[in-house]
């Protein structure tokens, strides 16, 4: 069953899989959505198969976020745009912190002070106007076996 | 505590419109969107669609495309459902219901207590 | 559309008994059904979500499980105040479908 106490992959160990993920959103309750050509965006579809992400440890408390249909990895572009790499590069890489609301953030370990965030009509939200504190930041992990 | 009110009854007449209403209170309103869902008398429920108040963007079932119109405004924190072209089959109880959000996702966690619809010559 | 055949329609038992209904998808809906309870004159309640998870106030006598396309409801003692019927529904397709309804009698 999807148990949203079910973390992200912070507290495995590098190199681990966890089983696929749904990241809902806080603001608006969207799922991050990774399409085949590279956009990012969110849906409120639990049936879309672009919504399970496969999150990897790389090391203690920073993922990477692989759409698993897509075969892309989610990156925070140096403009602040959201988009999803074919290849893991240095900007495929985010910190992943449970807040005290039992929500996670997902912050750039490239450019440290932006987050994967979701405006509330859907489209993602750039790393510049992202900060501590909003609602756009707080992804709650759930299951997303088939 | 979460409340939504809805309209009273109505007895309509076939060809007709009728527009209800949905009160909600006690959260913030443009947070979680707002379904609304049919039951004819001893029958199931069926979901209609559900209205976003944030920005008053609309999603419906196919069958109640053209049927059914959500709308809702922000600054009395109510939602709307017009239906319109009545029909017997459209007699009904329809409830609007808060989604949880959260860990509740999608799930209908507060519902009003129904408007009744009559549709008679 | 995803159909959701509630089974059975009725169930007349005795307060203190086990009982149990199932609700059984179309196609898989992985773990995303609910469970509803709707007393007479009384608009619908939420019991149960994802599958599996109590909503909050829910007595533990009421449990749900299943993932796919098999859901299980249970009320492990029937109380008279669980008078109602109760209604499956999934939120994974669009659009969302509700089971029939089971409604259950106390002798």
């Known amino acids: 069953p999807a148990l949203p106490e079910d973390g992200g992959s912070g507290a495995f160990p590098p190199g681990h899989f966890k089983d696929p993920k749904r990241l809902y959103c806080k603001n608006g309750g969207f799922f991050l959505r990774i399409h085949p050509d590279g956009r990012v965006d969110g849906v409120r579809e639990k049936s879309d198969p672009h919504i399970k992400l496969q999150l990897q440890a790389e090391e203690r408390g920073v993922v990477s976020i692989k759409g698993v249909c897509a075969n892309r990895y989610l990156a925070m572009k140096e403009d602040g745009r959201l988009l999803a790499s074919k290849c893991v590069t240095d900007e495929c890489f985010f910190f992943e912190r449970l807040e005290s609301n039992n929500y996670n953030t997902y912050r750039s370990r490239k450019y440290t002070s932006w987050y994967v965030a979701l405006k509330r009509t859907g489209q993602y939200k750039l790393g510049s106007k992202t900060g501590p504190g909003q609602k756009a930041i707080l992804f709650l992990p759930m299951s997303a076996k088939s | 505590e979460v409340h939504l009110q809805q309209s009273g009854p109505e007895l309509v007449k076939p060809g007709a419109s009728v527009k209800m209403s949905c009160k909600a209170s006690g959260y913030t309103f443009t947070n979680y969107v707002i379904n609304w869902v049919k039951q004819k008398p001893g029958q199931g429920l069926e979901w209609i669609g559900y209205?976003?108040?944030?920005?008053?963007?609309?999603k419906y079932n196919e069958k109640f495309k053209g049927k059914a119109t959500l709308t809702s405004d922000k600054s009395s924190s109510t939602a709307y459902m017009e239906l319109s072209s009545l029909t017997s089959e459209d007699s009904a109880v329809y409830y609007c219901?808060?989604?949880?959000?959260?860990?509740?996702?999608?799930?209908?966690?507060?519902w009003g207590q129904g408007t009744s619809v009559t549709v008679s010559s | 559309s995803i159909v959701m055949t509630q089974t059975p329609k009725f169930l007349l038992v005795s307060a203190g008994d086990r009982v149990t209904m199932t609700c059984k998808a179309s196609?898989?809906?992985?773990?995303?059904v609910g469970w509803y309870q709707q007393k007479p004159g009384q608009s619908p309640k939420l019991l149960i979500y994802?599958?599996?998870n109590r909503y909050s106030g829910v007595p533990d006598r009421f449990t749900g499980s299943g993932y796919g396309t098999d859901f299980t409801f249970t009320i492990s003692t029937v109380q008279a105040e669980d008078l109602a019927v109760y209604f499956c529904?999934?939120?994974?397709?669009?659009?969302?479908?509700f089971g029939g309804g089971t409604k259950l009698e106390i002798k």
């Open positions: 196609q898989s809906v992985s773990s995303d």
């Open positions: 994802s599958g599996s």
């Open positions: 219901a808060k989604e949880g959000g959260g860990k509740y996702v999608y799930a209908m966690d507060s």
């Open positions: 529904q999934q939120d994974y397709y669009s659009p969302w479908t």
């Open positions: 209205n976003d108040p944030y920005n008053d963007v609309s």
